[in-house]
């Protein structure tokens, strides 16, 4: 079951998935000036059995210089804040992902892919929050959010994280500070359009990936 909303927005924080549950879809988006190949897929799908998960279908982009069949439209200002764009970084696979049954690792980049990735999460997906550069975390509990099904509707749990002040460096180096969303924005208003980038993890992490993630070093 697909999650209808986005994970909640925390001011001065970004979220990432460490691994993607089976059923997750990743749109095959191409950068400006390129389009999906004629017979290409619209998306890749995380799929598998009890012992192995992988991304099904390949995204492929080709130059649209001769004929532009994929119209890339610049979002309107009100849409841009919904899109949570984050730049792609050079991929380094988190080593622990393979040990999570029923999950796929971050897919490797494809040639001429767009600068952001649009994921569609499924029920049971967990994402982790960290404060952006210049802000430090005040924890009241787990800094994570899970997509849950309640009374036939999907919802994301509220992460117990406040990002405050300056101090401390970002644990997502190289990322620009995102626009902080208005405080108290109801979860139901958030978009399900999920854009994210690769985690660059140096040290191996526990498969349970609880809040200890925040003590992990990132390079």
């Amino acid at each position: 079951e697909l999650c209808d909303d986005d994970p909640p927005e925390i001011p001065h924080a970004t979220f990432k998935a460490m691994a993607y549950k089976e059923g997750t879809m990743l749109n095959c988006e191409c950068k400006r000036g390129f389009r999906r190949i004629k017979s290409g897929s619209l998306y890749m799908l995380c799929t598998g059995n009890s012992s192995h998960s992988s991304w099904d279908n390949q995204c492929q982009c080709t130059s649209s210089a001769t004929r532009n069949t994929t119209k890339q439209v610049t979002p309107q200002p009100e849409e841009q804040k919904e899109r949570k764009t984050t730049e792609m970084q050079s991929p380094m696979q988190p080593v622990d992902q393979a040990s999570l049954p029923g999950h796929c690792r971050e897919p490797p980049p494809w040639e001429n892919e767009a600068t952001e990735r649009i994921y569609h999460f499924v029920v049971g997906q967990m994402v982790y929050y960290q404060c952006v550069q210049g802000y430090r975390a005040l924890h009241r509990g787990p800094a994570e959010s899970v997509c849950k099904m309640t009374h036939g509707k999907t919802r994301w749990t509220q992460p117990q994280l406040i990002c405050t002040g300056e101090m401390e460096t970002s644990q997502f180096p190289g990322e620009e500070k995102p626009q902080a969303s208005p405080e108290g924005r109801p979860e139901s208003e958030t978009s399900c359009l999920v854009t994210t980038t690769d985690f660059q993890i140096q040290t191996e992490m526990a498969a349970t990936m609880e809040t200890s993630i925040f003590t992990t070093e990132y390079q």
Partner: antibody, heavy 116, light 108 residues
Framework: QVKLQQSGTVLARPGASVKMSCKAS????????MHWVKQRPGQGLEWIGV????????SYNQKFKGKAKLTAVTSASTAYMELSSLTNEDSAVYYC?????????WGQGTTVTVSS | QIVLTQSPATMAASPGEKITITCSAS???????LHWYQQKPGFSPKLLIY???NLASGVPARFSGSGSGTSYSLTIGTMEAEDVATYYC?????????FGGGTKLELK
Amino acid sequence: QVKLQQSGTVLARPGASVKMSCKASGYRFTNYWMHWVKQRPGQGLEWIGVIYPGNSDTSYNQKFKGKAKLTAVTSASTAYMELSSLTNEDSAVYYCTREGEGSDYWGQGTTVTVSS
Amino acid sequence: QIVLTQSPATMAASPGEKITITCSASSSISSNYLHWYQQKPGFSPKLLIYRTSNLASGVPARFSGSGSGTSYSLTIGTMEAEDVATYYCQQGSSIPYTFGGGTKLELK
């Protein structure tokens, strides 16, 4: 609950153009691919094309390039399909359908009749 | 483009009978992108089975799907009168998406 409400029956002259709508409710419109499908009377289903409202990314069946144009207005949660240079062959029911896990929701269809 | 061929084109069955409809693809497709739809006269198609074998919400357990590569099938364990409809397979593995020609299931 999820609903796709399509515009009503259209009667058009050959050579004319028509624009039909598909208003989505009950879900975040920008986050699902919206497909359009044609069904001629007593015939099967034919895929026309698809639009991703989040960024207006489109893909078409080669057969309908130049015939159909897909657009979306996110503020109105509405997808549109414009058919141009109508002929009798375009007389059909046209469906919009959301792709989730398969095409999980369909509109009720817009009937287009081309007649002089 | 991938051509999907359904057989039979038409069939009549009695309540309680087991029904199997096949869908053959012109080239191999991933089972994750093969879906089945049911369309009753005068109505829009309805998702029946997604990704080859997963029952869509509200679909009775008498329906099942299987297959891989170029060969897929839809089975109705015990035919009921309300199952009278046209059934379509569809692939979403590559653009353009394509549908099978349909199988019209009638009551004997």
